[in-house]
């Protein structure tokens, strides 16, 4: 039997990834820096499939259901060219209908649909955040 890798204390494991949900308020850049500070190649989380989105949403809903959460998706050139900060391919998308526009170039999991959909928001807003790494 293959031994499952372990995650850092307080992080949860699912399908070869470790996830850390932090209920502290950070702007997007500071949240990313804090994720990196935990080591192991951690970044703000990429969400690459409906399967992964559902697992994360279920986990977070066990803690709270009202606060949006930063993920690792951003639009660094401010041209609606979104990319994952960890370099993952931007294929799966889960934008809610009213996501884009304004000075909103960072993505959050929205509490409006149980964290299954994303909205863009101003990157300087201070919010909870989700980190991810491969152990």
């Amino acid at each position: 039997q293959i031994q499952r890798p372990s995650c850092a204390p307080g992080w949860f494991y699912h399908k070869s990834n470790c996830y850390g949900y932090f209920r502290k308020l950070r702007n997007w850049s500071d949240a990313e820096l804090e994720c990196q500070s935990y080591g192991n190649g951690a970044h703000l989380a990429s969400i690459l499939s409906l399967k992964e989105a559902s697992t994360i949403a279920e986990y977070i809903s066990g803690y709270q259901r009202s606060q949006p959460i930063w993920i690792g998706l951003h639009d660094p050139q401010k041209r609606q060219q979104w990319q994952w900060i960890d370099g993952a391919m931007y294929l799966y998308r889960s934008w809610s209908g009213k996501s884009m526009g304004g000075n909103k170039h960072c993505a959050e999991m929205s509490s409006n649909n149980n964290f299954l959909t994303w909205s863009s928001n101003e990157c300087n807003k201070r919010q909870h955040f989700l980190c991810k790494y491969r152990p």
Epitope: I2, L48, S49, L50, S54, R93
Partner: antibody
Framework: EVQLQQSGAELVRPGASVRLSCTVS????????IHWVKQRPEQGLEWIGW????????QYASKFQGKATATSDTSSSTVYVHLSSLTSEDTAVYYC?????????????WGQGTLVTVSA | DIVLTQSPATLSVTPGDGVSLSCRAS??????LHWYHQKSHGSPRLLIK???QSISGIPSRFSGSGSGTDFTLTINNVETEDFGLYFC?????????FGAGTKLELK
């Protein structure tokens, strides 16, 4: 090379049940979900549900709740679907399928299908 | 549940023709739409993922486009091996759903 090998055709009586198998080779069965898909004769595809062989967790389309039950045996890299209280509406080809890796949702790998015929 | 409506139900073409198959979703599914081809008595085969992403080993005559609710699969210069059923599938939300299919047949 990833392969999904399904069990052979079944002829079953109305009201009976049947268990179909899908044996996976070429990747670790615990790394992703295995899905089941139904195709009735000359018709489209219907998603039945998935199982996570690592945990045994399952999710089903509401239409198949109580009709289909997915299980797995990681030691033999095999997943099963149990179909109960069979009627003529359950006559179909059943496919197991999976994605290329956990971070994707499209069905890359398919079994060859198992034909289930429900007839008196 | 998200309903996928494919049109036309049947398309009669001659080899060498170009064709477009439509898949319309009952609500926005972003770009989370995949296309499959199924020959008679065979298993489905993935052609295009996430609306427009090509698949290794699939001929370049197959291409996809669209986002939101309207999607198109285009086949340039249809070959005889392309005849059969084409299905779209969404992975935007559970339950996963498929379209009823478009049958591509020889004129």
């Amino acid at each position: 090379e990833v392969q999904l090998q399904q069990s052979g055709a079944e002829l079953v009586r109305p009201g009976a049940s049947v268990r179909l198998s899908c044996t996976v080779s070429g990747f670790n069965i615990e790394d992703d979900y295995i899905h089941w898909v139904k195709q009735r004769p000359e018709q489209g595809l219907e998603w039945i549900g998935w199982i996570d062989p690592e945990t045994g967790n399952t999710q089903y389309a509401s239409k198949f709740q109580g009709k289909a039950t997915a299980t797995s045996d990681t030691s033999s890299s095999t997943v099963y679907v149990h179909l109960s209280s069979l009627t003529s509406e359950d006559t179909a080809v059943y496919y197991c399928t999976t994605t290329s890796y956990y971070g994707s949702d499209e069905f890359v790998y398919w079994g060859q299908g198992t034909l289930v015929t429900v007839s008196a | 549940d998200i309903v996928l409506t494919q049109s036309p139900a049947t398309l009669s073409v001659t080899p060498g023709d170009g064709v477009s198959l439509s898949c319309r979703a009952s609500q926005s599914i972003n770009n989370n739409l995949h296309w499959y081809h199924q020959k008679s008595h065979g298993s489905p085969r993935l052609l295009i993922k996430y609306s427009s992403q090509s698949i290794s080993g699939i001929p370049s005559r197959f291409s996809g486009s669209g986002s939101g609710t309207d999607f198109t699969l285009t086949i340039n210069n249809v070959e005889t091996e392309d005849f059969g059923l084409y299905f779209c599938q969404q992975s935007n939300s559970w339950p996963l759903t498929f379209g009823a299919g478009t049958k591509l047949e020889l004129k």
